[in-house]
């Protein structure tokens, strides 16, 4: 028997904001003619389900967002590689929990300069997950303890910080006609998740009075 990692390796889910993409790599023996077929299943189920649109493909990724859409469920996926010469290898992922494993993207924020303040409005983050009534769930609806951390760099030594669950924030007491750097991150304490920051560089308006 051959070493299967010669043909196929690093089969794993890459998940961000509940978009769940299966990725893998060809091993050193992988050839351009190698084709890949993907199956998935839930925890404890006997049968693997072939993913339509990801059978005998040559690319090294497959979007399983719809098939893994129950974020309280545990899933597996596996890839079968068949080389041009007829060699085969099958590899499966570890148990995948979207709640546990998905990473958070930077939030979508609008930064509005005023004369002596900067307003920051965080927009709800949509996900590909549908609620029972058919609407798309937002991150805020999935993670009830989701919070935002907003920081405003005033100068090299001074930073203003706000934190909360609400969508609208305002930093007051700023100097007019001055540029500030704002960073906004989203975090979920219970799941030890924190996004990379959204960054906005804004200049307060000049004081016309």
């Amino acid at each position: 028997p051959e070493d299967l990692s010669d043909l196929l390796q690093n089969v794993k889910f890459q998940s961000s904001n509940f978009e769940n993409i299966l990725t893998w790599e060809s091993g050193p023996e992988g050839t351009p003619g190698t084709v890949y077929s993907i199956e998935y299943k839930t925890y404890g189920e006997r049968d693997w389900v072939a993913k339509k649109g990801c059978q005998r493909i040559t690319r090294k990724s497959c979007n399983l967002t719809v098939e893994t859409g129950n974020f309280t469920e545990l899933y597996y996926a596996r890839v079968t590689a068949v080389s041009a010469g007829g060699r085969t290898a099958t590899k499966m992922t570890d148990r995948f929990s979207a709640l546990q494993h998905t990473t958070l993207k930077p939030p979508d924020v609008t930064c509005i300069p005023k004369v002596r303040s900067i307003q920051m409005i965080v927009h709800p983050t949509p996900t590909p997950i549908r609620a029972g009534d058919g609407h798309w769930l937002t991150l805020e609806e999935i993670f009830h303890d989701l919070s935002y951390r907003l920081e405003l760099q005033v100068n090299r030594t001074y930073q203003m910080r706000l934190e909360g669950k609400q969508r609208e924030y305002e930093f007051f007491g700023l100097t007019p006609d001055t540029e500030f750097l704002g960073t906004i991150t989203v975090f979920v304490t219970t799941w030890f998740k924190e996004s990379a920051p959204y960054v906005c560089r804004v200049k307060t308006l000049p004081d016309r009075t």
């Epitope: 089969v11 794993k12 404890g44 499966m92 992922t93």
Partner: antibody, heavy 116, light 113 residues
Framework: EVQLVESGGGLVQPGGSLRLSCAAS????????MNWVRQAPGKGLEWIGE????????TYNQKFKGRFTISVDQSKNTAYLQMNSLRAEDTAVYYC?????????WGQGTLVTVSS | DIVMTQSPDSLAVSLGERATINCKSS????????????LAWYQQKPGQPPKLLIY???SRESGVPDRFSGSGSGTDFTLTISSLQAEDVAVYYC?????????FGQGTKVEIK
């Protein structure tokens, strides 16, 4: 046809080590999880731990963590149970069993006797 | 750890009669994702490995005779052999796969009366 065959059991002195093998045939070992379960003479079943043979990720029953190690050689289609610091109470038939939740295929078992 | 307790420890049943084995878990085995119960039943004959009979508390494994059935939910489960045959003499185990470590009941020995 799926088959699991354990080997490597035998008599070992207290404090000794033993490595059990589980040779899988009829399927690729990397296609499903593999478990080790033991049964002391005349007693019930005890789950030792599992491995995802594709990734090497293991989960152990806390009772065995540190003394027992599960591994896989993909090229041999074989799983292993390395047992260290063996004690008399480790005397049992050791089974490998396939699947990730309950166990659909079992080997015939290999007897490990720990005695001086 | 979830403790699985079977009753009785042994039972003797006449050929063709019903055999009922109970299994109680120390916490609910209802898996919220699919509203199924994470419980399996095995049969073990002397000198043989266990054989899977039932999973998800009531799903019969392929090839298992339909006289074997599983029922129950939450913490209380039952394996029923509707008409005991001579070849059903064995020890029967329940197993939970709700959480690590997976645990088994102590076993119930079924004999012919």
């Amino acid at each position: 046809e799926v088959q699991l065959v354990e080997s490597g059991g035998g008599l070992v002195q207290p404090g000794g080590s033993l490595r059990l093998s589980c040779a899988a045939s009829g399927y690729s070992i990397t296609a499903e999880y593999m478990n080790w379960v033991r049964q002391a003479p005349g007693k019930g079943l005890e789950w030792i731990g599992e491995i995802n043979p594709s990734t090497g990720t293991t989960t152990y029953n806390q009772k065995f963590k540190g003394r027992f190690t599960i591994s896989v050689d993909q090229s041999k289609n074989t799983a292993y149970l390395q047992m260290n610091s063996l004690r008399a109470e480790d005397t049992a038939v050791y089974y490998c069993a396939r699947f990730d939740a309950y166990f659909d295929y079992w080997g015939q078992g290999t007897l490990v006797t720990v005695s001086s | 750890d979830i403790v699985m307790t079977q009753s009785p420890d042994s039972l003797a049943v006449s050929l063709g009669e019903r055999a009922t084995i109970n299994c109680k878990s120390s916490q609910s085995l209802l898996y919220s994702s699919n509203q199924k119960n994470t419980l399996a039943w095995y049969q073990q004959k002397p000198g043989q490995p266990p054989k899977l009979l039932i999973y998800w508390a009531s799903s019969r494994e392929s090839g298992v005779p339909d006289r074997f059935s599983g029922s129950g939910s939450g913490t209380d489960f039952t394996l029923t052999i509707s008409s005991l045959q001579a070849e059903d003499v064995a020890v029967y185990y329940c197993q939970q796969y709700y959480s690590y470590p997976f645990t088994f009941g102590q076993g119930t020995k079924v004999e012919i009366k």
